[in-house]
Interface confidence: low
Amino acid sequence: AGHLEQPQISSTKTLSKTARLECVVSGITISATSVYWYRERPGEVIQFLVSISYDGTVRKESGIPSGKFEVDRIPETSTSTLTIHNVEKQDIATYYCALWEAQQELGKKIKVFGPGTKLIITDKQLDADVSPKPTIFLPSIAETKLQKAGTYLCLLEKFFPDVIKIHWQEKKSNTILGSQEGNTMKTNDTYMKFSWLTVPEKSLDKEHRCIVRHENNKNGVDQEIIFPPIKTDVITMDPKDNCSKDANDTLLLQLTNTSA
Amino acid sequence: AIELVPEHQTVPVSIGVPATLRCSMKGEAIGNYYINWYRKTQGNTMTFIYREKDIYGPGFKDNFQGDIDIAKNLAVLKILAPSERDEGSYYCACDTLGMGGEYTDKLIFGKGTRVTVEPRSQPHTKPSVFVMKNGTNVACLVKEFYPKDIRINLVSSKKITEFDPAIVISPSGKYNAVKLGKYEDSNSVTCSVQHDNKTVHSTDFEVKTDSTDHVKPKETENTKQPSKSCHKPKAIVHTEKVNMMSLTV
């Protein structure tokens, strides 16, 4: 089965620059299929723009100005690229790549879409680092004791643009866990968002990862925030003892950033 | 020119109660085209649901039914038993791939119909309320309540900033909510919730040594441990790939 990945979830440009949007095809040989590009402007219908067929023929939708869009494919990397020249406000949109995928039954085809890349045009000069800054929250003892479950919360702040994807996995597992999230909120010139994961008691002793995709992540890789295992046999103190006032009772965390 | 027009811009549905989306074709006979349905969820993922010829996307056949009403020139998509996973924008689209005549392999889309999912009407359920802290950041977690109307207050004398709460449907078909804030005195922050004309406090759920039943530690358990606010990391974590965390008590 064909699968399309658009590694950039967003692409931020200033006016008149050139944007290059990538689409990686897997499961199908790119030189044996046509790749289509669609655009969804805010509040408008999704519209076909341009396609490149298996033999390299390019077809543009009528009414699309010539010279605006360029499409090509690189068989070696199984990638199709949509280049948007001289970006302007009316190019603000989400761009999807797509292809027709044959089904097992003869004559049945479906068109599958990539996850889309949002083109953002800005005139702001932003701080050098507008990647998401994480803060982690571990389950409260009350929740783990009373509900035999625990909630991890991953807070991400001070990022730009607003396009962000968050998912959760257990360490050493590729299964995406069912999580919940708040809306992305604007704070001054940047954005914040949080996501939370509730796991049953039996999973609290496993390490969990909050995985964040954002245009401005360092080195362009997904950021992984590690949530350490929780010991559920940790027991109660006299509630009158306020451990936060007594350094001997608190847990100190040495936090070391290790890029990999 | 051909146009696909959804019947509604927004369709609220209840969990488990069938819902029907309709999309009419203007300017052409719907029978001359193949109709497709897609769903766009949070994060812009466009997922194929249905195409004429009884083709369904993976995982859609059991809970979705596509149909064409030739007489009314419209396409119909039925969600047989909606769940919270079905929230999103639904698009009808048409093509003439393989129909002969003008070979159009592009899709022509209609505007989306936003499907919002609400829990079924059910007995009222009081929330559980828990506080989570890290540095100046405080999160109030409100779990498993119904109905939706709720006011969440983080109680502090030294507020830096607060954010609007996120209220979502829980996997069990009730609501969960989280409210975040930043406070100079985060250690002393508690959370109180107004729901269904009652007030629920996070302190109601704190584990006490003299509590009874399932809260009481078993005799085999160690009885000395940090209090609930002590197993929170104190620092903000800035990571790229790995956190090396060493714990010292």
């Epitope: - | 209840s14 069938p18 029907t20 009403d69 079924r120 009407s121």
Partner: antibody, heavy 121, light 112 residues
Framework: QVQLVQSGAEVKKPGSSVKVSCKAS????????INWVRQAPGQGLEWMGG????????NYAQKFQDRVTITADKSTNTAYMELSSLRSEDTAVFYC??????????????WGQGTLVTVSS | DIVMTQTPLSSPVTLGQPASISCRSS???????????LSWLQQRPGQPPRLLIY???NRFSGVPDRFSGSGAGTDFTLNISRVEADDVGVYYC?????????FGGGTKVEIK
């Protein structure tokens, strides 16, 4: 326009069975409930049971449970009601009716023309 | 089973005058999903029944606005604001909240 067309009138002997058909056209057959309703001469309406073809399983009124079988053929958009062990008091007009937009719960929005079954020795 | 009781059994009315039919259920018709699945049907002489009102008060497509439904819980009413000759027939209430689906005994509307 949705239409439900039923098979013709039948005369049956006591103890025998009758199978009435109901062919749907002009709408989606699969996802609506097709119900069967009995109306004895000069009497009111009585629900016998119904089926949602998509799911394939039928629901029956207790009174008819042992004698009625409701089926659906998705390929021909046709529903069937078979009533066995007929007795004279089964003489009635049998209607098929489509449940509304959510299976059973709208009420019955479209009705067949009715099939008169006469049970007589 | 839910028993549906209609009153009156028969209602002679003058053309142009209003008519009202009552339907009472033996238990609440509020479904666990919050909806109330009570509908009204009209059966003209020699014809199959026809849906007028669904979910208490929603008029089915093509039904004149002189027909209206109201009620809640266990008590429901069908109103005809100005009776026309065409309205002669038997009117049934029906519940689809719980299996088995059940009908009222019917109310005959005739012209005086």
């Amino acid at each position: 326009q949705v239409q439900l067309v039923q098979s013709g009138a039948e005369v049956k002997k006591p103890g025998s069975s009758v199978k009435v058909s109901c062919k749907a056209s002009g709408g989606t057959f699969n996802i609506y409930a097709i119900n069967w309703v009995r109306q004895a001469p000069g009497q009111g309406l009585e629900w016998m049971g119904g089926i949602i073809p998509f799911f394939g399983t039928a629901n029956y009124a207790q009174k008819f449970q042992d004698r009625v079988t409701i089926t659906a053929d998705k390929s021909t958009n046709t529903a069937y009601m078979e009533l066995s062990s007929l007795r004279s008091e089964d003489t009635a007009v049998f209607y098929c009716a489509r449940g509304g937009d959510s299976g059973y719960d709208w009420g019955f929005d479209y009705w067949g023309q009715g099939t008169l079954v006469t049970v007589s020795s | 089973d839910i028993v549906m009781t209609q009153t009156p059994l028969s209602s002679p009315v003058t053309l142009g005058q209003p008519a009202s039919i009552s339907c009472r259920s033996s238990q609440s018709l509020v479904h666990s999903d919050g909806n109330t699945y009570l509908s009204w049907l009209q059966q003209r002489p020699g014809q199959p029944p026809r849906l007028l009102i669904y979910q208490i008060s929603n008029r089915f497509s093509g039904v004149p606005d002189r027909f209206s439904g109201s009620g809640a819980g266990t008590d429901f009413t069908l109103n005809i604001s100005r009776v026309e000759a065409d309205d002669v027939g038997v009117y049934y209430c029906m519940q689809a909240t719980q299996f088995p689906l059940t009908f009222g005994g019917g109310t005959k509307v005739e012209i005086k």
